[in-house]
Every structure is written in C-alpha cells, then in structure tokens.
C-alpha cells in the first residue's frame, strides 16, 4: 500500500461583470492551501447574463437584479454548497454605468440598490456592488493578464519563487462604452492621474494607465452614426444594400453623442440611412473621433491625453480580439502587421451587404459594423496609441489565457480578496497533487 | 431534424394542478435552455419562464411564480412544466420552445428557434 | 416592464402587395426578433436580431429599426403569408411579445 493525498480543498470567488452591453458573471477557483502562489487562481466557470447591461435598465432596476438570477442559481450549482458561506461575491460595473451616472444619478444608485438587494438574498459571502472607475478597470485588467501569464513570480525548479526575467505585458481593453490601455512604465507620468504604483510580491510596479470613455465599440458606433447622420445623409461604413430606420432619439440620448446633437431635434423622429461601402470616407468618419491638436504634456495619445510611448508587449482583448477575430477567421484576411490590419478594414468596408452576408454565412447578426469596428481599431492602435509596426508586432489578441477570460474581474478578485499579497514569498515547497 | 414533441390537450378542474411535457429529439438536450411561453385564446404570447437543462436553474417571469414550476429528465430529454391551483384564466396553449443563440463580439444574443406544437390546457368543472 | 404595440392589429393585403407591419416599445430595445403563426400552429421564427433573415424563411420577408421603432416588410404578398405576426424582445426581462398582427389576403 501506499499514501495517497487526497487534493486540497478549494475555495471559491465570484465576480459579476456588470458591462455597458451585457453581465457575465466568472466564478474563480483556488487551493485553500496555496493561496499566496501566482498562478494559482483558475476560472472554474462562467455564464452570460440574458438581456442588456444593468445600465440599460435605469427604468425598470428591478428587472436589472431579475436578470442576474439564472446566473447566480447557476453558481448555487457551480459552488460546492459547504463553499457557499465563505465565497466572496462582487459586482463591478463598468463604463455603462459611469455614463448612467453622470446623466443619471439616481437612477445609478437605483439600479445599484436592487441589485444589492437581489444578491444580498443568496447564500454567498457579498461583499458589494459598485461602480469602477476608470482607472480601476484599466489596472485590473493589467493585473488579471500578468497573473494568468504568471509574469509577476514563478516557482523556479530549485525551489525558490524567482521574478521572471521577461517583464510584464501591456494590457489593452476595448469594452462597449469605454477602452482602457495600461503599461509598466520606467519614467514617471506627467500626469499623476494616470500613473498607479504597485507592490505586487515583494516587487514595485510604476504602471501608465488611462480609461477612454465613450470609445467602447458601441458608443463609438453611436457617434459614428451621428458623425454619419450630420454629415453625409448616409452611412459610409456600412455596406452598400443594407439601410435601416434610425430612431434620432436613440442616437443622441448618450452623453456620448451630445456634442453632435442637432439643438432642435424630434426625438421621435426616424430617419431611413443607408450604406455606401466606402472605405475611406470611413476612415475619415473614424478619425474624426481622434484629436490631435493640442497636447498640455511633452508627448500625447489623442484628445490632449498624456501617454508615454508603448513599450513592451501588450496583450489586446474582449473588442480588440473579437474585432480581430473576426477578420482572421471570418473573413480569413491576414492580420500580423498594421498594414495587413488596415488592408482587412478596408477589405471589409468594401463588401457589398450580399457580398457580406455571403461570405459570412451563419453569423449576419450585426455584421453591418463590422467594416466601422475593424476601422476604429486599427485607427486606435496606430493614430490614438502610436503603434508602429515593429510595436504592433508585440502585441496578441487573445480571449483567455490558462482557460480564463482576460479582463478586470480577476485581477479585481485578487486585490479584494488580498490573493496577491504585497510581500515576497519565503522559501517554499511546492507539492505536486498529480 | 429538431423536434419539441408536446401532447394535445389536458382538461383539468379548477383548483387542480397538471404537469405537461416536451420531448426534445434532434440535438444535444442539454445544450439549450428550454422556455415556456403561454397563448391565452385569440391573444398574444407571455413568457412564463426557462430551465438550464445542464444544472436544473430555472428563470421565471415574476407574474409566473408560484403558478409554474419547471423540471427535466435528462434521461429521457424531457422538460416539464407543472401548473397549480388552476383558475379559468389558466386555460390556453402552453408552447415549449428551445432557446437559440448567436454571438456577437462576444455577447449572447438569444430567440425562441423551434418550437413544440403546443398543449392545451381547458380548466373547467 | 417593456410594452410592445404592434400595428395594425389586422391588416387586409392583396396578393403581389409590398407591405409593413410594425412594433413600437416603451422603451429602447437593442434589437427585436419577428414570430409568423399560421392558424392552429406554433409560433415560426422569421426574422432574428431586427433583421436577419432565420433559416427557410423566403427573401421577400426583411426587418429594420432601432431604438423604439421596429419594422417587417413583405415585398411581395403571397398566399401562404395570411397568417399572425408578432414582434419579440430580449433587451431586458422580463421578455415581451407585441399583441400581434393578423395579415389577411383579399
């Protein structure tokens, strides 16, 4: 006979990600033993919340709690019930309710209230629901790639915990109401506001990050359907043969499109617009959306924002993979340079609608903005963020790394549940339970 | 070819309680939610509410709770639908309907694809 | 809880006609889907996300809207259209169905 260990006992964390568009909730799993580890913290499952974001419901917040709860049944399912009492559970909202927020106060707080009355009902430890800023969204999602790609520490064969010589991933977020680009940087930030230090096991950390609102892919589209509206009279990123009827009301309700906003309008008003499958007049359209006039700082993004120039690898995902993704394997056009990736925009503002829907069989669903979302993409990554093609050729566009979704919701776990502590690890021994 | 198999018709007195059943054949059963949605005589249709087939979650429409409970048996690739303290307003068509999807930039977006045939249920003493 | 108001509630077509049928909310919705039932059978899906086109469905039958304003439009009528339509939301729960449009043929 022979011992056999029986494997740790896990524990569990919850997070809903309250986005602009849609909810998902991750459940995260760990073992009780290990921790402080990095790396060791795994997606155990997820669930995609019907309907819109919490945010669309700022008339109706009861009916945002009602549709978490499929969801949250499933994580009564998911969870080990002797793991119920003691896992924590958080929802973080996004750019959606930040919006909300700033035209909208009470109805935030309202759609905040119900929803902590709904998750307050289930067994788990709750420990709140709130809205994150920018800032937060950005560096939470630095944090969740850099964990799961184990850049902070790793177990060396000798058994020590050793910092890998490799240094840490940029991470870039494109969300439906906002973009976050965040980077480990050496020299201070100009602005204070987008500079966050971090002490992450035993290791300073002088990160650049800044939250973009209103450049989420659906805002974007918003404005650029304004842009369309009061410009042309029809829509040049959408494809030749497809129209559509388009509620002004709709168009201009977001703080987003108030700068484009007719000052007499009827917001009952439709207006039939149509596509023209015009690459460059797209192009245009999209980078009207970009300022570059003036800049208080020694160096910019766009719209007078300080960056310092990208450096190092950087990780894109959720729009920014999806986008790409889309024209890789979709469209089957090759993307690994920039020129390559505004070859594939240009290609795909050009289809027809019956080209489009021809060569897309299967996934029409909104496949109209594509053509805008490839455009505004490769126009952020090249104008706003000052990718060249040699800093363009670190970047991946990636959903999950080691089976978990990349995005705020992990890195946001570890920090509140002090996963990551601040001081480095003593010497351990690692115990294989294979 | 999918298939929602749902049976004619049941006449219950009023205050009783009926169970009707959907038969899936054609796809993975526990692949899809299964939804219930009511047609009242000459009236439009009502969402009562869904069940995860996977982990036995269930989601009602609020005017539904209490009325509705649904159920499977993965075995057999059936939902269920129980209805109590049946009223005259209770008497319609109750549909069974398997829930689509697509993505979209990683969203899910979701519809009713196929349908049962429908079962009637006439509350009557 | 979204409200949705089809109209007409019955529309008289002759065969050959282009037509419209249409689906107000009460509130924004990010997309509508389209049901067709036909007399004494279950609901057929026809057009999901506002427009697009379910699988069999003829090319004569298109969707467009946005906002609170949805539309179905049949180009060119034909028999086998007569029949009940209904506009259908999944924005925000709890899920809704207009009261319908029954499209006759003269």
């Known amino acids: 006979t022979r011992d056999v260990r029986e494997p740790p006992a896990l524990k569990y964390g919850i997070v809903l990600d309250a986005g602009s568009s849609h909810t998902s909730m991750f459940i995260y799993k760990w073992p009780a033993d290990k921790e402080n580890d990095t790396g060791i913290v795994g997606q155990h499952s997820s669930c995609d919340v019907p309907g819109g974001g919490i945010s669309s419901y700022a008339d109706n917040p009861s009916g945002a709690s009602q549709s978490l709860v499929g969801c949250l049944e499933q994580a009564l399912q998911d969870v080990p019930k002797e793991r119920h009492a003691g896992t924590p559970l958080y929802l973080g909202a996004t750019a959606g309710m930040r919006l909300l927020n700033l035209t909208n106060p009470e109805a935030s707080t309202s759609v905040l209230m119900a929803v902590t009355h709904t998750l307050t009902q289930y067994p788990f430890d709750f420990r709140g629901a709130r809205i994150l800023s920018g800032q937060e969204e950005g560096v939470f999602g630095w944090v969740t790639a850099n964990y799961l790609l184990e850049n902070f520490i790793k177990y060396g064969w000798v058994g020590r915990w050793f910092r890998p010589r490799k240094g840490t991933l940029g991470a870039m977020d494109l969300g439906g109401a906002s973009t976050q680009i965040t980077f480990e940087t050496t020299s201070p930030a100009e602005d204070r506001a987008s500079e966050v230090q971090l002490h992450l096991y035993g290791q300073h950390y002088r990160v650049y990050t800044h939250s973009f609102l209103c450049y989420g892919r659906d805002q974007v589209l918003q404005r650029l359907l304004a842009s369309a509206l009061q410009t042309h009279g029809f829509h040049p990123c959408w494809p030749r043969g497809f129209s559509t009827q388009v509620l002004l009301g709709d168009v201009y309700q977001s703080p987003c499109t108030m700068a484009q906003r007719p000052q007499n309008f009827n917001s009952s008003a439709r207006v039939s617009l149509s596509g023209s499958s015009d690459p460059h007049l797209c192009r245009d359209l999209v980078s009207g959306l970009f300022s570059f006039s003036s800049c208080p700082f020694s160096r910019c993004s766009f719209n007078g924002v300080f960056q310092p120039p990208v450096a190092g690898n950087f990780v894109a995902f959720s729009a920014f993979f999806y986008t790409v993704d889309f024209l890789r394997t979709s469209m089957g056009l090759p993307v690994a340079t920039l020129q390559q990736l505004e070859a594939a925009a240009v290609n795909v503002c050009n289809q027809t609608w019956a080209q489009l829907q021809a060569r897309v069989p299967g996934q029409r669903a909104r496949l109209a903005d594509y053509c805008a979302g490839a455009m505004f993409v490769q126009q952020l990554l090249s104008r706003g963020y000052g990718f060249d093609e040699r800093a363009f050729g670190g970047v991946i566009f990636q959903k999950k790394a080691a089976d978990t979704a990349v995005g705020w919701a992990l890195g946001y776990m570890l920090n509140l549940t002090n996963l990551i502590p601040a001081d480095p690890p003593g010497l351990r021994k690692g115990t294989d339970f294979s | 070819e999918v298939q929602l198999q749902q049976f004619g018709a049941e006449l219950v007195k009023p205050g009783a309680s009926v169970k009707i059943s959907c038969k899936a054949s054609?796809?993975?059963?526990?692949?899809?939610?299964m939804d219930w949605v009511k047609q009242s005589h000459g009236k439009s249709l009502e969402w009562i509410g869904d069940?995860?087939?996977?982990?036995?979650?269930?989601s009602y429409n609020q005017k539904f709770k209490g009325k509705a409970t649904l159920t499977v048996d993965k075995s057999s690739s059936t939902a269920y639908m129980e209805l109590r303290s049946l009223t005259s307003e209770d008497t319609a068509v109750y549909y069974c309907?398997?829930?689509?999807?697509?993505?979209?930039?990683?969203?899910?977006?979701?519809?009713?694809?196929?349908w049962g045939a429908g079962t009637t249920v006439t509350v009557s003493s | 809880q979204i409200v949705l108001t089809q109209s007409p509630a019955i529309m008289s077509a002759s065969l050959g006609e282009e037509i419209t049928l249409t689906c107000s909310a009460s509130?924004?919705?990010?997309?509508m889907h389209w049901y067709q039932q036909k007399s004494g059978t279950s609901p057929k899906l026809l057009i999901y996300?506002?427009?697009n086109l379910a699988s069999g469905v003829p090319s004569r039958f298109s969707g467009s809207g946005s906002g609170t304003f949805y539309s179905l439009t049949i180009s060119s009528v034909e028999a086998e259209d007569a029949a009940d339509y209904y506009c259908?939301?999944?924005?925000?729960?709890?899920?809704?169905f207009g009261g319908g449009t029954k499209l006759e043929i003269k």
């Open positions: 309907a398997r829930r689509g999807f697509f993505l979209y930039y990683g969203s899910s977006y979701y519809y009713f694809d196929v």
């Open positions: 259908h939301q999944w924005s925000s729960y709890p899920w809704t």
């Open positions: 509130s924004s919705v990010s997309y």
């Open positions: 069940i995860n087939p996977n982990y036995d979650i269930t």
């Open positions: 996300s506002t427009s």
């Open positions: 054609g796809y993975t059963f526990t692949d899809y939610n």
